[in-house]
Interface confidence: low
């Protein structure tokens, strides 16, 4: 690569969100960088709450569980973790907090171990598509992520980009297929209001998927069918009215599947038959006692479990000749 | 090849404005965040501003806070830095970057320059 006559050591100090340059020595075997607390014996560094704006270059090659949540980073960029030799161990990674507001193409590359990555509490205003790929090719090398936490990554309202929050973060899911082998994904609490429809089909190991807390309306384009391994489904705290048949039954062949639907606001009237006679014969749903209707207001606090048929009707439509005012 | 094409430096006049482009080619521009450096005269190399892959984020160096405004255009693979009321200390050949890796690795990219110089 070219570069300015000078080198990149002699960047400017006035710039502070300029990653300085940095040596391709491997660090000393027993180092522990500036503002970390590092064990061995643990395989663990722990940089936390030190407002650190950059990723330590001179982490451990023994460190196995690395923490640099509560920190300042703003931006990972390509290559981030990326050292010699590499950080070969790295298994978990936690950057939680972080103020982190940009994730770009590659950030976590030539970590050949990371089984489990923790992005949540971070205002991702960009998340690179190829985030966790590393490669914009169609079909990339296996990511060895097994566990993905991405809970409360979405940034406010007014640093959103002009485009769908939840179609970036699906991207970032679905480049180049390198995900095939995540069994954990949680996307608890990013206001997402839809889930794009080829996502699950495209991420056939899940076992555990926490969409809680969001503002999902309906799972009516959403097909469970291929999860064959789910465990645990966490839809809590959305926004669903009704669950129709082709969920019903796709959840219904799911082998080892929990469902968890609290506190969404269930409208009982005659679209929920299917669902309430779901709800009296399924083993799925976890807690499915305290589930209630939300609307129409004379229903409010019912408990699906005991409604029948006769409780579940809609008001006739009354033809335009007939509406009032 | 990774190339990165400057164009529009020049002479202006103090409180003048130039528009600085930055021609990529050689891999996916939308998939990185790009920067703009200058060097002045005997100086060091400083960031002036950086943009994020789809534009809804960019940082700026201090100096010049309120007075440029970088931006791209993805479906051009070209990256721009507008340059309002210029100062003499302005005066500084500016860089385009990519950085496609980590900048320890080599993976970083450079345009060759533009000059811009402010003088009445």
């Known amino acids: 690569s070219s570069s300015p006559t000078s080198s990149a050591s002699s960047f400017s100090s006035s710039a502070p969100f300029l990653a300085s340059a940095v040596s391709a020595q491997p660090p000393l075997p027993d180092q522990c960088p500036a503002l970390c607390e590092c064990s061995e014996a643990a395989r663990t560094v722990k940089c936390v709450n030190r407002n650190l704006t950059e990723v330590p270059t001179d982490l451990p090659a023994y460190v196995r569980n690395l923490f640099l949540t509560g920190n300042q980073l703003a931006v990972l960029p390509a290559g981030a973790f990326a050292r010699r030799p590499p950080l070969a161990e790295l298994a978990a990674l936690n950057l939680s907090g972080s103020r982190l507001d940009e994730v770009r193409a590659g950030a976590f590359e030539h970590l050949p171990s990371l089984r489990q990555l923790d992005l949540s509490h971070n205002p991702l205003a960009d998340l690179s598509p190829f985030a966790f790929s590393g490669s914009n090719a169609s079909v990339s090398a296996p990511s060895p992520l097994v566990e993905l936490i991405l809970n409360h990554i979405v940034p406010p309202e007014d640093e959103r980009q002009n485009r769908s929050f939840e179609g970036m973060v699906v991207a970032a899911l679905l480049a180049g297929r390198a995900l095939q082998g995540l069994r954990r994904l949680e996307l608890a609490s990013n206001h997402f209001l839809y889930l794009p429809r080829d996502v699950l089909a495209q991420l056939p190991s899940l076992r555990h998927l926490d969409l809680s807390n969001n503002s999902l309306v309906s799972l009516t384009y959403v097909s469970f069918r291929n999860l064959t391994h789910l465990e645990s489904l966490h839809l809590e705290d959305n926004a669903l009215k009704v669950l129709h048949n082709g969920t019903l039954a796709e959840l219904q062949g799911l082998p080892h599947i929990r469902v968890f639907l609290d506190n969404n606001p269930w409208v009982c009237d005659c679209h929920m038959a299917d669902m309430v006679t779901w709800l009296k014969e399924t083993e799925v749903v976890q807690g499915k006692d305290r589930l209630t209707c939300a609307y129409p207001e004379k229903m409010r606090n019912r408990v699906l479990l005991e409604l029948n048929s006769a409780d579940l009707d809609c008001d006739p439509i009354l033809p335009p000749s007939l509406q009032t005012s | 090849e990774v190339q990165l094409v400057e164009s529009g430096g020049g002479l202006v006049q103090p409180g003048g404005s130039l528009r600085l482009s930055c021609a990529a080619s050689g891999f996916t521009f939308s998939s990185y965040a790009m920067s703009w450096y200058r060097q002045a005269p005997g100086k060091g190399l400083e960031l002036v501003a950086s943009?994020?892959?789809?534009?809804?984020?960019?940082r700026y160096a201090d100096s010049v806070k309120g007075r440029f405004t970088i931006s791209r255009d993805n479906a051009k693979n070209t990256l721009y830095l507008q340059m309002n009321s210029l100062r003499a200390e302005d005066t500084a050949v500016y860089y385009c970057?990519?950085?496609?890796?980590?900048?320890?690795?080599?993976?970083?990219?450079w345009g060759q320059g533009t000059l811009v110089t402010v003088s009445s």
């Open positions: 943009i994020t892959t789809a534009g809804g984020s960019t």
């Open positions: 970057n990519a950085e496609l890796g980590p900048r320890r690795l080599g993976m970083d990219y």
